[in-house]
Interface confidence: medium
């Protein structure tokens, strides 16, 4: 029996469409597939950022694949052809690997890129990113932010920069339609008359950087002689009630009594008849049902009851 062989795919390349990290990997069918006309050829694609220990592996019948990468590092990929066992009367046949790499030739020394990039999606409504200028860069250096997510035709530049001493140090984003639960890509590059500036690339998902508004309208209600119900309302905005976790801090007679995390807008507290003062604050965070991560809101305004014996009155602030 002659050994069945197959060639690797042709013209394997990584194409950058200008989406700040979302790249196309594409290829053409291997040469000499005439023997296997009745066969559906498959391709095994492996790719990673250079320096990563693990490869991502995809098996596909298509001639392209798209995914997001960290453009601060290079990318390497390899692909080979697979002939399923149905085509070869027995075992699967694999071609040799075709390999390719891609990287953006870095300009400037690493110290010139922006420092301490921080992005917060306030109340799941307003995205704000801020940064510090690179180390030792001159005041003539200015930074520009570009962003892209799936659904935009092309990368967009920030139109509302936050400035300090004439330098851009942040961006207030416009309304970002249908932008959550997908990768959000940012590039901050820079220009200076004196020296080249290193670009920085960032990728995150907006629902994971949400900082909600604090809860509002805190109230007390006497439930029984030894129980008080603390209650509050979710802040206005697009975040549904099911997406909140709350942290409560309760002080009884100036002593920290309880810190608790709860999933709904009430908390029942056991008290004694001797309690003279009760204060509590609440803060909110998007929970694990709606995001993988989040930022605690600021604490609500403190709500207190003092003076009258708590057991004698219904407490509706």
């Amino acid at each position: 029996d002659t050994e069945i062989k197959v060639n690797p795919p042709q013209d394997f390349e990584i194409v950058d469409p200008g989406y700040l990290g979302y790249l196309y990997l594409q290829w053409q069918p291997p040469l000499s597939l005439d023997h296997f006309k009745e066969c559906t050829v498959e391709y095994e694609l492996k790719y990673r950022n250079i320096g990563s220990e693990t490869w991502k592996t995809i098996i596909t019948k298509n001639l392209h694949y798209k995914d997001g990468f960290d453009l601060n590092k290079g990318i390497e990929a390899k692909i080979h052809t697979l002939l399923p066992w149905q085509c070869t009367n027995g075992s699967e046949v694999q071609s040799s690997w075709a390999e390719t790499t891609y990287w953006i030739s870095p300009q400037g020394i690493p110290e010139t890129k922006v420092q301490d990039m921080d992005c917060v999606y306030y109340n799941w409504q307003y995205l704000l990113c801020s940064w510090k200028p690179g180390i030792g860069v001159l005041l003539d250096t200015n930074y520009n932010l570009f962003y892209w997510y799936e659904g935009l035709d092309h990368a967009l530049q920030c139109v509302d920069y936050i400035k300090a001493d004439g330098q851009n140090i942040g961006c207030r984003f416009p309304y970002l339609e249908a932008s959550d639960y997908k990768d959000f890509y940012i590039c901050v590059n820079g220009s200076s008359e004196n020296k080249p500036i290193r670009s920085s690339y960032f990728t995150f998902q907006l629902q994971n950087i949400v900082k909600p508004l604090p809860p509002v309208y805190l109230t007390f209600t006497r439930e029984s002689s030894c129980e008080i119900k603390l209650k509050w309302s979710i802040p206005l905005g697009p975040i549904p009630a099911r997406c909140f976790d709350y942290e409560i801090e309760i002080r009884e007679d100036d002593t920290t009594l309880v810190t608790a995390t709860v999933e709904n807008e009430t908390y029942t507290l056991k008290t004694t008849n001797e309690t003279r003062q009760l204060c509590f604050v609440v803060r909110s965070k998007v929970n694990i049902y709606c995001s993988d991560d989040g930022i605690w809101s600021e604490w609500s305004d403190k709500q207190c009851w003092e003076g009258e014996d708590l057991s004698k009155k219904t407490l509706l602030r």
Epitope: Q125, V216, Y217, L236, G237, P238, D301, K302, C304
Partner: antibody, heavy 119, light 111 residues
Framework: QVQLVQSGAEVKKPGSSVKVSCKAS????????MNWVRQAPGQGLEWMGR????????DYNQNFKDRVTITADKSTSTAYMELSSLRSEDTAVYYC????????????WGQGTLVTVSS | DIVMTQSPDSLAVSLGERATINCRAS??????????MNWYQQKPGQPPKLLIY???RQGSGVPDRFSGSGSGTDFTLTISSLQAEDVAVYYC?????????FGGGTKLEIK
């Protein structure tokens, strides 16, 4: 608990001015907007303006044609409303009223200050 | 200015029955997906009390029988089962644009 305590009733001559105070307690004064609303005898409510004590930002109802001035003193947690060029139709109860933000309504009101304008 | 028109001017309802008050704005009071519409109750000799904010959210300590609905220009305050202590004047108010404006009020009485 939250309290807004207003200054006492006033009787004023037409053409004069009145300044009503509103002392806030039981909450962080600078975290809430302070509104001023008036109500003529037997009539409805009329919003006069508001101040954000945090940064001093003020919005007025232009119907008062520059006759109203709203101020706030963070150090004493007190808001003030001054109405000048008084006329008889300014006779009303004037309320200060706390609001968390524009979409949250006005959740605490002062007891009201009756200003009577009469010659 | 946004003009708020309330109807009816007065309303008499039997104890335990449903009371419905309507408010229409001269233009939409919605923004950012929120309706900037609030409802207040005022009893004689007292300042108003916030019942409903953002069209449908209850203020602090407001009984569950009070509810609000609507969006855009048309809004409704509903008292599901009228109690004696609900006799008052009810006002709607928009806070989308300065100047904030109130409806003319609806006087609710017991039949």
């Amino acid at each position: 608990q939250v309290q807004l305590v207003q200054s006492g009733a006033e009787v004023k001559k037409p053409g004069s001015s009145v300044k009503v105070s509103c002392k806030a307690s039981g909450y962080t004064f600078s975290n809430y907007l302070m509104n001023w609303v008036r109500q003529a005898p037997g009539q409805g409510l009329e919003w006069m303006g508001r101040i954000d004590p945090y940064d001093g930002d003020i919005d007025y109802n232009q119907n008062f044609k520059d006759r109203v001035t709203i101020t706030a003193d963070k150090s004493t947690s007190t808001a003030y409303m001054e109405l000048s060029s008084l006329r008889s139709e300014d006779t009303a109860v004037y309320y200060c009223a706390r609001g968390y933000g524009t979409a949250y309504g006005v959740d605490y009101w002062g007891q009201g200050t009756l200003v009577t304008v009469s010659s | 200015d946004i003009v708020m028109t309330q109807s009816p001017d007065s309303l008499a309802v039997s104890l335990g029955e449903r009371a419905t008050i309507n408010c229409r704005a001269s233009e939409s009071v919605d923004n950012y997906g929120i309706s900037f519409m609030n409802w207040y109750q005022q009893k004689p000799g007292q300042p108003p009390k916030l019942l409903i904010y953002a069209a449908s959210r209850q203020g602090s300590g407001v009984p569950d029988r009070f509810s609000g609905s609507g969006s855009g220009t048309d809004f409704t305050l509903t008292i599901s089962s009228l109690q004696a202590e609900d006799v008052a004047v009810y006002y709607c108010q928009q806070s989308k644009e300065v100047p904030w404006t109130f409806g003319g009020g609806t006087k609710l009485e017991i039949k």
